[in-house]
Interface confidence: low
């Protein structure tokens, strides 16, 4: 969570002289309350935009827009504080619109925008617009908040942003998984154009259950340049356990741009009697970068084995 680096932050518009300042998220009207305070914003609109930084990186930003109510309190409006809270970390970033001239009523409703909060993929944010000065203690609140979920890197618009590309979003492994005789799975996927190793995480589940009955991890060494974009085939030996029939195969790459934090791709094989995957399966969660929710594992012995080769 940060501000877009090189942009001159402008909030002036016809009929209003305004400047944007960094804020500590604690306006001094909290400390020195005023008797007369403005009403809250009428509407807040938030959408996702993509902007370029001064280094030429494409980054996702929040476009925040709000309007004023058409009441006399705009005569006491001295500015606004914009606050963005990243919900999972409680990290907060604020800026302050400081009005250098008095607002007057005009023929259109006053409208303000700000598009400089750089956000992360797949994160939820709470955006608050607080009119200034803030109300006295026990006064009517004069802010509005709205939550916004930034799409993950699967989203077409996000896929081309720098944080997503550096996480490996442009790699499409096109995973195929087929069940072979003798309790084996054949996993095939397309290698990326980088000499880096991969890891296949196999988690098996009983029919209609989310407690695993088998787990196996298999390393694939870095391919040679002539193998880039070729298919890699791996045969995994399953545990011979009746009913342990639903298999989630997850491929974790270790690209140089994201190392242990690269996007993973999954494919699932359903139990024979189940035509569709009944529900999403929690991600396997190794130490280096858990990606989503977890579930408990059953007490078991993992004796899986595997072979692999690159297919030209």
């Amino acid at each position: 969570l940060r501000l877009l680096d090189h942009r001159a932050l402008v909030c002036s518009q016809p009929g209003l002289n305004c400047t944007v300042k960094n804020s500590t998220c604690l306006d001094d009207s909290w400390i020195h309350p005023r008797n007369l305070t403005p009403s809250s914003p009428k509407n807040i609109y938030i959408n996702l935009s993509v902007s370029s930084t001064q280094h030429g990186e494409l980054v996702p930003v929040l476009h925040v827009e709000w309007t004023l109510q058409t009441d006399a309190s705009i005569l006491y409006l001295e500015g606004a504080e914009l606050s963005v809270l990243q919900l999972n970390t409680n990290e907060r970033l604020c800026v302050r619109f400081e009005f250098l001239s008095k607002l007057r009523h005009h023929h259109r409703r006053w409208r303000f925008t700000f598009s400089h909060f750089v956000v992360d993929p797949d994160q939820e944010y709470e955006v608050t617009v607080h009119h200034l000065p803030k109300p006295i203690p026990d006064g009517d609140p004069n802010h509005q908040s709205k939550n916004f979920l930034v799409p993950d890197c699967e989203h077409a618009r996000m896929k081309v942003t720098t944080p997503c590309m550096s996480s490996g979003s442009l790699w499409d492994p096109n995973i195929t998984v087929e069940t072979l005789e003798a309790h084996q799975l054949r996993v095939s996927f397309t290698l990326w154009n980088e000499s880096t190793h991969y890891q296949i995480l196999l988690t098996s589940f009983p029919h209609m259950e989310n407690h695993s009955c088998f787990e196996h991890m298999h390393h694939i060494p870095a391919p040679r340049p002539e193998e880039f974009h070729q298919r890699s085939n791996v045969t995994l030996t399953l545990r011979n356990l009746k009913g342990c029939c639903r298999h989630q195969v997850q491929i974790q790459p270790f690209f140089s741009s994201c190392l242990n934090d690269c996007l993973r791709h999954s494919a699932t094989v359903s139990c024979p009697e189940m035509p569709d995957t009944p529900e999403p399966i929690p991600d396997y969660m190794p130490l280096w970068e858990p990606r989503s929710g977890s579930s408990d594992y059953k007490d078991d012995d993992d004796k899986g084995s595997s072979h692999h080769h690159h297919h030209h």
Partner: antibody, heavy 118, light 107 residues
């Protein structure tokens, strides 16, 4: 050279607070998950907390949940541990440690000592 | 939560002896297990990851084996510089628990 340097340890009274820092250098800090691990005098290693590369996943040991907060500033190549409501049993050497690609923790700091005593 | 136990808690062996330390998980953890060596007054050092993969720079006399719930660290020929405490650690999911440690010294 890949390096982690902890700081911020010291003597604090029970119920007090401390903030530990870990400065990383020699590697792309923003690409790595990080951990805090501690070791009480004469005792074994105890994993304390984990934060993923983009702070999207955070875990704590039950013994510190609700009292300790892990955070990071990728722009400053720094990892933090805010420790509140400290207890005698929090007395330990605190290490920050980087996970290895493939598993385990391959880079450790020298540790910073926290002593909780009245 | 999954518990990690180690045995023995301490051992004394002669230089050149084969030393075996075991680590047991209360539930299956596949091969998501690491072994560390910690010398007195020093920070821990990674020896083995993925249960059996030797960390680069670690002498080949160290080896790891096991999968599921039972794991072994073996020092094929004990050297004076191997005097240390050895810890196993699971890392399949949080909490990333360490075993209680095994102290190794020379007879």
């Amino acid at each position: 050279e890949v390096q982690l340097v902890e700081s911020g340890g010291g003597l604090v009274q029970p119920g007090g607070s401390l903030r530990l820092s870990c400065a990383a250098s020699g590697f792309t800090f923003s690409s790595y998950s990080m951990n805090w691990v501690r070791q009480a005098p004469g005792k074994g290693l105890e994993w304390v907390s984990f934060i993923s590369a983009r702070s999207s996943t955070i875990y704590y040991a039950d013994s510190v949940k609700g009292r300790f907060t892990i955070s990071r500033d990728n722009a400053k190549n720094s990892l933090y541990l805010q420790m509140n409501s400290l207890r005698d049993e929090d007395t330990a050497v605190y290490y920050c440690a980087r996970p290895k690609v493939g598993g385990g923790m391959d880079v450790w700091g020298q540790g910073t000592t926290v002593t909780v005593s009245s | 939560d999954i518990q990690m136990t180690q045995s023995p808690s301490s051992l004394s062996a002669s230089v050149g002896d084969r030393v075996t330390i075991t680590c047991r998980a209360s539930q299956g953890i596949s091969n998501y297990l690491a072994w560390y060596q910690q010398k007195p007054g020093k920070f821990p050092e990674l020896l083995i990851y993925a249960a059996s993969t030797l960390q680069s720079g670690v002498p080949s006399r160290f080896s790891g084996s096991g999968s599921g719930t039972d794991f072994t660290l073996t020092i094929s020929s004990l050297q004076p510089e191997d005097v240390a405490t050895y810890y196993c650690q699971k890392y399949n999911r949080a909490p990333f628990t360490f075993g209680p440690g095994t102290k190794v010294d020379i007879k």
